[in-house]
Interface confidence: low
């Protein structure tokens, strides 16, 4: 029976359940390589408290949908009388990378986790040439998460001081040129995730092979090679490589661009000061404050909540956006689909999508970019569930009480994107 | 239609040794791993050993390993099981499988019966 995912194949994921202190290696295709977990292990939990090794799904043992796959074994749990097997289940669902496996919730028997990656999709424009793992968790089983820095298009530049010469990285999977406007980049060859471009030429200088690699607590690697048998003339007969270290700042501090810190032979090494580098507790919420123990800087925008049934407008030209963020309040236009972000069709107000719900809500600030996100909206064509991005900027002079208004700038492949200018949005140190 | 032929089987005596092998018939594929496994009657079928073919890697369960050793020729997609010291719980009928690497298909043996005697 045919597993749906072949890209996700070659690399063994890890996942977490932070409450019990338990980390998941899950290989779809193959095993785990575990020995401990037997050797056709699909899914091996890591009880780290007790530690012990459980096998919760058998690489044998596999049944798929194009949605669902699931792994069951044969060792049995009581459930109400039953005579059940361990299994675990995982749901899959379109994303614009490969993504993260995420633990969901754990029964007696079933240990649920949930999937967004391009290989869910049901069409391919998100796939990539190349792509690896672009997360890794710490001995403490907290996530540092790079995948928000991925490019679907273009490239980032690294900062050196060769005028001759630039060179363009991605992260984590190749640059893709066709997508992007940008001149410069037309000319990089396919499946380069380092492109060096000189004049009116552009050479790979590196392709992802390995995933994210944590090296200290405070430092993540990428390594990527050049696979193509042939040197390049300007390298002395070297193969190119790229070696960029993404290091957590000791503080709060704004974003800073990829730095050139050596280079010999075709042989690049970058540093990358960002706060994508911490681990994700730090950066992220699950509420609308980030004030907790994990994070130094205390924003709230719980005041920006609607009350009674009113929401904010946000007009697209084709659309107009009904935003209710911060609460659980349904927008009435939005026909009980616990929307966030409402999308009505101004020439058809029967054509309403959810751009994103209440349930499925993410703060994050990090590199002084501070973002609400909501996900898990109504599907689009390539199996895409929308979702909204609301980049905020502190404005203490804003209309409305301080409050102000978020204005839609622009929508790319179902994700919609807002600024709100509010005072709420403006960051308080946290007092030591 | 890919399909797996075992071969080697038989009966033996405890101490004794058999040579298992598994080659396809049909049309010829590259594998991501092949394996040996077996069920004898009125159990669950057991992995008994895998051979990774991307990294060479080998798994034994617990209760073969030092006796039994996989080994195979990955452009031929044959898998062999070398049994040595056989003993009367190793009786059982031995399935091979091997999962292709484009499609992640699982294809099974039809099997072939080992029997140890005291």
């Known amino acids: 029976q045919a597993a749906p995912f072949p890209e996700l194949c070659s690399y063994t994921w890890e996942a977490v359940d932070t409450k019990n202190n338990v980390l998941y290696k899950i290989n779809i295709c193959g095993s785990v390589d575990i020995v401990q977990c037997g050797p056709s292990s699909a899914v091996c939990m890591h009880d780290l408290k007790t530690r012990t090794y459980h096998s919760v799904g058998d690489s044998v043992l596999r049944s798929a949908t194009r949605s669902l796959l699931e792994f069951n074994t044969t060792v049995s749990c009581d459930q109400q009388g039953t005579n059940h097997r361990v299994q675990s289940s995982i749901a899959f669902l379109c994303g614009k990378t490969l993504g993260t496996p995420e633990f969901v919730t754990a029964t007696e028997c079933v240990h649920y986790f949930e999937w967004r990656t391009t290989a869910a999709c049901k069409k391919d424009i998100f796939k990539a040439n190349k792509e690896v793992p672009c997360y890794v968790f710490d001995e403490e089983l907290r996530k540092h998460d790079l995948n928000p820095l991925i490019k679907l298009s273009g490239a980032y530049l690294v900062d050196d001081s060769d005028p001759d010469t630039s060179l363009f990285i991605n992260v984590c999977r190749d640059i893709d040129t066709l997508r992007d406007p940008g001149s410069q980049l037309r000319a990089c060859p396919p499946g380069t995730a380092a492109c060096l471009v000189r004049g009116h030429q552009a050479f790979d200088v590196g392709q992802p092979r390995d995933g994210l690699k944590l090296v200290r607590k405070d430092r993540l690697v990428l390594s990527y090679v050049r696979e193509e048998a042939g040197k390049l003339d300007f390298c002395d007969g070297h193969s190119p490589a790229v070696t960029i270290t993404f290091v957590c700042p000791s503080e709060r501090r704004e974003g800073t661009i990829p730095k050139l810190t050596a280079k010999s032979n075709c042989r690049y090494e970058i540093e990358w000061i960002t706060e994508y580098a911490c681990h994700r507790d730090y950066l992220e919420s699950k509420t609308c404050s980030l004030s907790g123990e994990q994070q130094d800087v205390s924003i709230d925008l719980t005041p920006l909540a609607q009350s009674g049934g009113s929401s904010y407008i946000s007009d697209g030209k084709e659309y107009l956006f009904y935003l209710n963020v911060c609460g659980e309040t349904e927008i009435q236009f939005c026909n009980k689909k616990q929307a966030a972000v409402c999308q009505v069709k101004k020439s058809d107000t029967s054509q309403v999508k959810a751009a994103g719900r209440y349930h499925n809500q993410t703060l994050r600030y990090s590199d002084g970019d501070l973002t609400l996100i909501y996900f898990g909206g109504d599907e689009c064509s390539s199996g895409f569930q929308r979702m909204s991005v609301i980049n905020f900027e502190c404005n203490k002079t804003a209309g409305n009480d301080g409050k102000g208004t978020p204005v839609f700038t622009g929508e790319v492949d179902c994700t919609y994107f807002f600024t709100w200018d509010t005072e709420y949005a403006c960051v308080k140190e946290k007092e030591d | 239609q890919v399909q797996l032929q075992e071969s080697g089987g038989g009966l033996v005596q405890a101490g004794g040794s058999l040579r298992l092998t598994c080659a396809p018939s049909?049309?010829?594929?590259?594998?991501?791993?092949m394996a040996w496994f077996r069920q004898a009657p009125g159990k669950e079928r057991e992995i008994v050993a895998r051979?990774?073919?991307?990294?060479?890697?080998?798994f034994y369960t617990e209760s073969v390993k030092g006796r039994f050793t996989i080994s195979g020729d990955n452009a031929k997609n044959t898998v062999y099981l070398q049994m040595t010291n056989l003993k009367p719980e190793d009786t059982a009928v031995y399935y091979c499988?091997?999962?292709?690497?484009?499609?992640?298909?699982?294809?099974w043996g039809q099997g072939t019966q080992v029997t140890v005697s005291s």
């Open positions: 049909g049309r010829t594929y590259s594998t991501y791993w």
């Open positions: 051979i990774n073919w991307s990294d060479g890697s080998t």
């Open positions: 499988l091997a999962r292709t690497v484009v499609s992640l298909d699982d294809y």
